[in-house]
Interface confidence: low
């Protein structure tokens, strides 16, 4: 048994440009505390992987109020070792996680908020007993400081704190059952502790945790009588000829144990003594609950208050996490189109959208005719969301500033001529044709193929009537089509301009909310 | 198993006192930010006052109802939380319920108030 | 402060009915909604959090829907022991408030 203990030095910006200069949101001043997590081995764990060493969790430390022209200091922090008892032997070989958080002290209802701020995770050598180890780490824009060590608490000594010993100075001399500290005069030792279930009869161990089997007995805890009948010639545990291996596995090995537990048989199956904080058939079972208040960032926990049962977080919008303690970056999906600027509020995604565009995700392209006039003399057109430019005779293109020549696509059929016009284009048709593009042959009694003229037009002038009706046509439609884009342009430019007044009044809100 | 229970309720006149208390088991106490809501048929349910951690300073909130006149206050040790109630209203009779967890999760039976002449 | 309205303010149904109670808030609230169910001399008891989350031990019957401002709790198949007041309350701005509550009454 023995302590590992973590001393944090500071905690600040990172060296470099773009370090942070606060590490409270904009709802105001926060606080900083930490939470360091032992696993064994050498192994990339997940996050989420139980801390089955231990895990310990500081005290909040002060207050901290961004100053808006001093320079980013290292932060307050709380004061104190972190210690991580552990009850067996020390690994030597371990994963050390330290995450800082961040608690908000905002108007929050349920509880502070709670966000994870950095996480540095190192895999690390260490013997117990030793001095001091020095550590610097980076986490994103964040730099941490820190000092770790792991000590035995007697009567265990040693690297791993396996050795048990007891001082010889209180009692003149060794008690019942304890022996000389081989290499510490002063001190006296027990027994190796056997491996838990070890048959006292027939297994014996040297080392701690072992279980070393008698001649004529086999098995992880020497419980299983060697067969001499079907195994002879097999060389058994204890290295004669009269035993024989158990085929398959006996029920604890590979320690079915979760989370630090110990196996022992029973008569076909196995039994698991959990360490303290883990409960179930194989220690699975965490034993923080909900009321231990586990859910960060306002999750709800769900799950019995009483110490059998485990516990599930369900986290509100914009965090997740077995105890919600990650935020989902939700903006990193790019939901704003068009260039929109890209809001998490937490409970819900704001689109900030750029001049011309609307809607929840910007994806409406207002395109307003005010803000993208038609060049040259070009009439702005709205409708569906989008914007063209009508432009005038000898300009084309998406805002009519490209020349173009009306009558390049001959349009005027018949060998009529083509004349460019400020309304369009007019046609001289061809003696025998009439139409805006002569496109109708006129009959030889005189009559043409088109409705019977209005009084005033001979039938005999075909080219001047063709050419009174297509100008007459043309402004009409004009006319016509100015009125009907006003109209529709002042209800779109309406309901848009109620929807953002609308919309910017929420963000607001919920912005200083 | 979750509980909490309300004690010190009873009738008392307009401009009186009243101290309620409230004492939480099978909860890490200490972990919990404390409220309390009380219930009459005229108004239905009304949060009432808030306080929180050691690590907060004890930081307390109240209803604007009642600011200036009810002091909320806990103490870890014993898993309890108080309400003092001062220059009291008629308004302020109801049953008074205290309350924890994030959605208000955890009640106690609450327990009742009468201020009457 | 945050105004939450219930409607009805009682109903009466039979056992096996499909019940909708309502809820509608004066501004924007997410989906930071809870009902509570409230038996007779008993102390409100947690239903539905999160506007649509079931809470640990409630019965599949009951369902909360909405966002924003429009809340509802449905009772997919009313039982006798469905008698009750129901309440919501809104815990997205400070202070948290509660409707007036709707009554549930079995014929």
């Known amino acids: 048994a023995g302590v590992f203990e973590l001393q944090i030095h500071s905690f600040g910006p990172g060296p470099g440009p773009g370090a942070p200069r606060s590490p409270c949101s904009a709802r105001g001043p926060c606080r900083l505390f930490f939470r360091v997590c032992l696993k064994p081995g050498l192994s990339e764990e997940a996050a989420e992987s139980p801390c089955a060493l231990g895990a310990a969790l500081s005290a909040r430390g002060p207050v901290y109020t961004e100053q808006p022209e001093a320079p980013a200091p290292d932060l307050p922090l709380p004061n104190g070792l972190l210690q991580v008892p552990f009850r067996d032997a020390w690994p030597g070989t371990f994963s050390l996680i330290i995450e800082t958080w961040r608690e908000e002290l905002g108007d929050q209802i349920g509880g502070p908020a709670w966000s994870l701020l950095a996480r540095v995770t190192r895999r690390r050598r260490l013997a117990a007993g030793g001095p001091w180890a020095r550590d610097i780490q980076r986490a994103g824009a964040w730099e941490l400081r820190f000092s770790y060590r792991a000590r035995c608490e007697l009567p265990a000594v040693g690297t791993a704190c396996t050795r048990l010993c007891r001082p010889r100075s209180a009692p003149s001399r060794c008690g019942p059952g304890l022996r000389p500290c081989a290499p510490l005069e002063d001190e006296c030792e027990a027994p190796p502790v056997c491996r838990a279930g070890c048959s006292l009869e027939h297994g014996f161990c040297e080392q701690p945790g072992e279980c070393r089997c008698l001649e004529g007995w086999t098995g992880p805890l020497c419980m299983v009588p060697v067969s001499t009948s079907s195994c002879l010639g097999l060389r058994g545990p204890s290295s004669t000829t009269t035993g024989c291996l158990v085929p398959g596995p006996g029920p604890c090995d590979g320690n079915p144990c979760a989370n630090g537990g110990s196996c022992s048989e029973t008569p076909g199956s196995f039994e698991c003594t959990c360490p303290r904080g883990f409960y179930g058939l194989r220690c699975e079972v965490s034993g923080v609950t909900c009321a231990d208040g586990p859910c960060f960032n306002g999750g709800l926990c769900v799950g019995g208050a009483d110490p059998d049962s485990a516990y599930i977080c369900h986290c509100p919008p914009g965090f997740q996490g077995s105890n919600c303690e990650k935020r989902v970056d939700r903006c990193s999906l790019q939901p704003c189109r068009n260039g929109g600027l890209c809001l998490d509020l937490g409970h819900a995604l704001r689109c900030r959208c750029r001049a011309g565009f609307a809607g929840p995700r910007c994806e409406h392209d207002l395109d307003d005719c005010a803000g993208r006039a038609c060049a040259n003399g070009g009439t702005c057109v709205e409708g569906g969301g989008a914007h063209r430019c009508s432009c005038a005779l000898g300009f084309g293109g998406r805002n009519c500033r490209e020349r173009a020549d009306p009558c390049a696509a001959r349009p005027c059929a018949h060998g009529g001529r083509c004349y460019a016009h400020f309304s369009g284009l007019v046609c001289a048709c061809a003696p025998g044709y009439m139409g805006a593009r002569c496109e109708f042959p006129v009959h030889p009694d005189g009559v043409s193929a088109l409705p019977a003229a209005p009084p005033g037009l001979r039938p005999g002038d075909p080219q001047r009537a063709g050419v009174i009706a297509v100008i007459v046509v043309v402004v009409i439609a004009i006319v016509a089509g100015i009125v009907v884009l006003v109209i529709s342009r002042k209800k779109r430019m309406a309901k848009y301009e109620k929807a953002e007044i609308k919309e910017m009044g929420e963000m607001h809100r919920e912005l200083n909310a | 198993e979750v509980k909490l229970e309300e004690s010190g309720g009873g009738l008392v006149q307009p401009g009186g006192s009243m101290k309620l208390s409230c004492v939480a088991s099978?909860?890490?106490?200490?972990?919990?930010?404390m409220n309390w809501v009380r219930q009459s048929p005229e108004k239905g349910l009304e949060w009432v006052a808030q306080?929180?951690?050691?690590?907060?300073?004890?930081?307390?909130h109240y209803a604007e109802s009642v600011k200036g006149r009810f002091t909320i206050s806990r103490d870890d040790s014993k898993g309890s939380v108080y309400l003092q109630m001062n220059n009291l209203r008629t308004e302020d009779t109801g049953i008074h319920y205290c309350?924890?967890?994030?959605?208000?999760?955890?009640w106690g039976q609450g327990t009742t108030l009468t201020v009457s002449s | 402060n945050i105004v939450m309205t219930q409607s009805p303010k009682s109903m009466s149904m039979s056992v096996g009915e499909r019940v909708t109670l309502s809820c509608k808030a004066s501004?924007?609230?997410?989906?930071?909604v809870s009902w509570f169910q409230q038996k007779p001399e008993q102390s409100p008891k947690l239903l539905i959090y999160?506007?649509?989350n079931r809470y640990t031990g409630v019965p599949d019957r009951f369902t909360g829907s909405g966002s924003a401002t429009d809340f509802t709790l449905t009772i997919s198949s009313v039982q006798a022991e469905d008698l009750a007041d129901y309440h919501c309350?809104?815990?997205?701005?400070?202070?948290?408030?509660f409707g007036g509550g709707t009554k549930l009454e079995i014929k």
């Open positions: 309350t924890t967890g994030y959605y208000f999760d955890y």
């Open positions: 099978g909860i890490t106490f200490s972990n919990f930010w």
């Open positions: 306080i929180r951690l050691k690590s907060d300073d004890y930081a307390t």
């Open positions: 501004e924007n609230v997410g989906t930071y």
């Open positions: 999160g506007a649509s």
């Open positions: 309350g809104q815990f997205y701005s400070f202070p948290c408030t």
